[in-house]
Amino acid sequence: ILLRAVTGFSGDGRAIWSKNPNFTPVNESQLFLYDTFPKNFFWGIGTGALQVEGSWKKDGKGPSIWDHFIHTHLKNVSSTNGSSDSYIFLEKDLSALDFIGVSFYQFSISWPRLFPDGIVTVANAKGLQYYSTLLDALVLRNIEPIVTLYHWDLPLALQEKYGGWKNDTIIDIFNDYATYCFQMFGDRVKYWITIHNPYLVAWHGYGTGMHAPGEKGNLAAVYTVGHNLIKAHSKVWHNYNTHFRPHQKGWLSITLGSHWIEPNRSENTMDIFKCQQSMVSVLGWFANPIHGDGDYPEGMRKKLFSVLPIFSEAEKHEMRGTADFFAFSFGPNNFKPLNTMAKMGQNVSLNLREALNWIKLEYNNPRILIAENGWFTDSRVKTEDTTAIYMMKNFLSQVLQAIRLDEIRVFGYTAWSLLDGFEWQDAYTIRRGLFYVDFNSKQKERKPKSSAHYYKQIIRENGFSL
């Protein structure tokens, strides 16, 4: 109430940029905090199927839009066939997980590995077996699986037949796929993520053309795709809530990614307004319908009148509250390259703590899972990844401060990534793994980097001890 009265903002995220120390939720003087995370804090690590599995056409797997995009757009990359070969070296991934001592492993299911043409008929047996084996092994190790249904590898057949996410037919097809996964894996999975970072799917897939399917400059398609992703997520949430939650007793969310931004002039109302608009246009675009009032942010509705689809009153009611926690991604994919339209002439910043405070203010202090966090190193860096350690310490410190000092309800943290792998438009020019993989080797050994040792210690101590 004080915040509202003093700042003149109705509890929204603009208060974050107020530099009056009495009212800003983030006290910049608390630079480092030696403390532990809450008891039972959920420590994990993640991968994306397309990035690490390899075997892009092995054992009956169908091509994805990314397999196609790699061959048509990324001229210097042969394929993801090499990658870390997680499909072949599952045991090595499990050993890496054992080494770090995580509480959970977040991975994604490759839709075309289960259903080569995307349509749910008889599943590809080898694909089904792979995920089933992985889940059984995790359960055996007491590692909680967090499973993402869609991490960008849409079956190519759905792109070619329907135009992919531009066509609302895909909503029901995605729901069928989700239903199958709930039926087959739901006994072992308590945490589901429907879609990983839909903002990037829409913006880079249809706006900049930097991601598959590589369409450029079609703002109407960007927002149509976003609309269909939100509706697909909502449909799957209702499906899970009605038919599976009663007996499987799990939770389901969608991972939303964002940058953070600071005003050029901290006292300037204009710049603060632009920062708010920047966050709203990226994170708010998806968070508002799902975690907010069920509709797009008002400013977007007004400005994008010719391209932003409209939710009916019934749809708004249906969208609202369709996430059991706020899954948040904060990493390089939302920063490089940053949508200049979203930047609004302000300064990007890696302040995760402030981003978490913004979420708290905008969306009524939800429970938050950091579903992806980390940075990257140049591909030439092998196991001595000091920059990655520095970034991890910085990010984790910010998360700890957010929990201890700002009373933000972060319950888990996903370090990204378990393994070096295929990094989307950057292909193999950067590395994000805590384990080094030589992509040219036969055996693809997972070698722990300094960051793996560091993260292992953080988990063991549950934070930073003096």
Epitope: N218, Q277, K302
Partner: antibody, heavy 119, light 107 residues
Amino acid sequence: QVQLVQSGAEVKKPGASVKVSCMASGYIFTSYDINWVRQATGQGPEWMGWMNPYSGSTGYAQNFQGRVTMTRDTSINTAYMELSSLRSEDTAVYYCAKYNWNYGAFDFWGQGTMVTVSS
Amino acid sequence: DIQMTQSPSSLSASVGDRVTITCQASQDITKYLNWYQQKPGKAPKLLIYDTFILETGVPSRFSGSGSGTDFTLTISSLQPEDIATYYCQQYDNLPLTFGQGTRLEIK
């Protein structure tokens, strides 16, 4: 730099049609809507509608529905506005304007095309 | 349609004066308002968007304020080059509508 260059002045008889062109340069033509606004002498501007150059989709103000058609030719980065069944009250300067999504405003305008409707 | 009413319709001021132009909307438009400057024989030029944000290159003597139905454009110290007609425009609802204009001249 961004430029919108419109076709020259037109004199038309009542009942005829006029087609005004607007050639864009200095930005990616298909990435921003082109809107058309007209202004009669001594009056405030009047919004006529929008056209998305990427898809060709359009939206027209009620006052012009059925009489206006907005099109484009992406190969030459040009937008067109055709107004039919002209009457004397359509005499005005017609402007094309680039719509900036971030602002919710027209950040660049053409120089205007004077259309005179007279018998 | 939302009607935009500007006042005064014309005003005369001296160089260095503080000048205020108001714009009233026929219904609540929150903050979805822009201001344009138009010089004789020229196209309108964007000055301010979202009620108070100055377009790049616009001198800081221009400022905007207001919310709901009442909005103001202020020139803190009038300069000779500010002689023009000023228009407000709402984008809260389609159709987009403009005010009838305020003509500013030097005394």
